[in-house]
């Protein structure tokens, strides 16, 4: 299953990065799981994950740094609280969970660049 | 003549970006000209240029947004005053001017990403 995502995204100076993850569904899935993975130094870690029913809202856990919305085969993902040290390749993984058969799709990754802002001068 | 430069550089939150431009000199050049070009929307414009004698300092014009130092076949370039709208591909062009023969080398470009900082809150 093909998953498309942008090659590069810049986080805002507030540490927020948004990108679209789009998948070409081979079937009529009603339940979809979206996972954001971060790859750095050949280590892959899970950033966040959400399961949603087609036509319903995408809901991440309350303490997740991710939020998102879905529209058809597109998922709009937003990652917050990013620092310069979080710069890396963020991979979108899509799994069609129900009905069977299960399908897997993994994007090539979005390089998210994050620059820490300069601190503001103290107000006297 | 081969010219190497990094693929990607992030400007600091102060709008400063630095990168190294390295060239493989086919001869014993004593006079070298370095030009930084910006490519955006298939338009190429000159950002800055400097000519230097090998072993001497690299000197840009006083009103230039570029500064630099040279060491052997390496030039350390710094571009200042960058804004988000200046994000683009910055190409390093190196010309061996003297003694003859003349040689030209053009790098593949460095994608410089610039994020405008959030304004600091007004101090009351």
């Amino acid at each position: 299953m093909h998953v498309a995502q942008p090659a590069v995204v810049l986080a805002s100076s507030r540490g927020i990065a948004s990108f679209v993850c789009e998948y070409a569904s081979p079937g009529k899935a009603t339940e979809v799981r979206v996972t954001v993975l971060r790859q750095a130094d050949s280590q892959v870690t899970e950033v966040c994950a959400a399961t949603y029913m087609m036509g319903n809202e995408l809901t991440f856990l309350d303490d997740s740094i991710c939020t998102g919305t879905s529209s058809g085969n597109q998922v709009n993902l937003t990652i917050q609280g990013l620092r310069a040290m979080d710069t890396g390749l963020y991979i979108c993984k899509v799994e069609l969970m129900y009905p069977p058969p299960y399908y897997l799709g993994i994007g090539n990754g979005t390089q998210i660049y994050v620059i820490d802002p300069e601190p503001c001068p103290d107000s006297d | 003549m081969h010219v190497a430069q990094p693929a990607v550089v992030l400007a600091s939150s102060r709008g400063i970006a630095s990168f190294v431009c390295e060239y493989a000199s086919p001869g014993k050049a004593t006079e070298v000209r370095v030009t930084v070009l910006r490519q955006a929307d298939s338009q190429v414009t000159e950002v800055c240029a400097a000519t230097y004698m090998m072993g001497n300092e690299l000197t840009f014009l006083d009103d230039s947004i570029c500064t630099g130092t040279s060491s052997g076949n390496q030039v350390n370039l710094t571009i200042q005053g960058l804004r988000a709208m200046d994000t683009g591909l910055y190409i390093c062009k190196v010309e061996l001017m003297y003694p003859p023969p003349y040689y030209l080398g053009i790098g593949n470009g460095t994608q410089i990403y610039v994020i405008d900082p959030e304004p600091c809150p007004d101090s009351d």
Partner: antibody, heavy 120, light 107 residues
Framework: QVQLVESGGGVVQPGRSLRLSCAAS????????MHWVRQAPGKGLEWVAV????????YYADSVKGRFTISRDNSKNTLYLQMNSLRAEDTAVYYC?????????????WGQGTTVTVSS | DIQMTQSPSSLSASVGDRVTITCRAS??????LNWYQQKPGKAPKFLIY???ILQSGVPSGFSASGSGPDFTLTISSLQPEDFATYYC?????????FGPGTKVDIK
Amino acid sequence: QVQLVESGGGVVQPGRSLRLSCAASGFTFSSYGMHWVRQAPGKGLEWVAVIWYDGSHKYYADSVKGRFTISRDNSKNTLYLQMNSLRAEDTAVYYCARGAVVVPAAMDVWGQGTTVTVSS
Amino acid sequence: DIQMTQSPSSLSASVGDRVTITCRASQNISRYLNWYQQKPGKAPKFLIYVASILQSGVPSGFSASGSGPDFTLTISSLQPEDFATYYCQQSYSTPFTFGPGTKVDIK
């Protein structure tokens, strides 16, 4: 170290039932999908079933659908395979395997296997 | 269901030889192919996932490539410990089918 240990195999008559267990240690069991894979004597590998990390999804090979049930107890770090209506062709070494984080169906850790023989 | 085929089914080689095994899926499975090594009486060992990514600890003499329906596993210089049976497996869609295996034995 990361380890999977299967148990519960044995000789059983056709039509009867058997329950296999797989005890996991050395990793956070509740974070991984788990699989059962079998290998008939002198044959290749055959995927049997998978269960998601939280038990929310289960998928089966057509050859065992309706007869076998995969389950897990995350509090006990244990994976199970309930096998009913056993047939001679179910005779095999049964392996439990851990699904990889990135690709759940890539099995990165395997147990040593437990042998099931269905014979009258 | 996606069928997996492998060729050759067996091959004889010597230590130091370069060995290539091919795996074909009955439909496009993108890059979602894994490779395993199994020695007699032992459990399979995970070698490669997503067509070409080596699992940590796997010797660099192993490499793999491919996309769509066609994939290859290459051992650049066969070592004594590499004599085994190699299986490919698709992780694209359920049921997660294995290839029939390729047995690599000593010439």
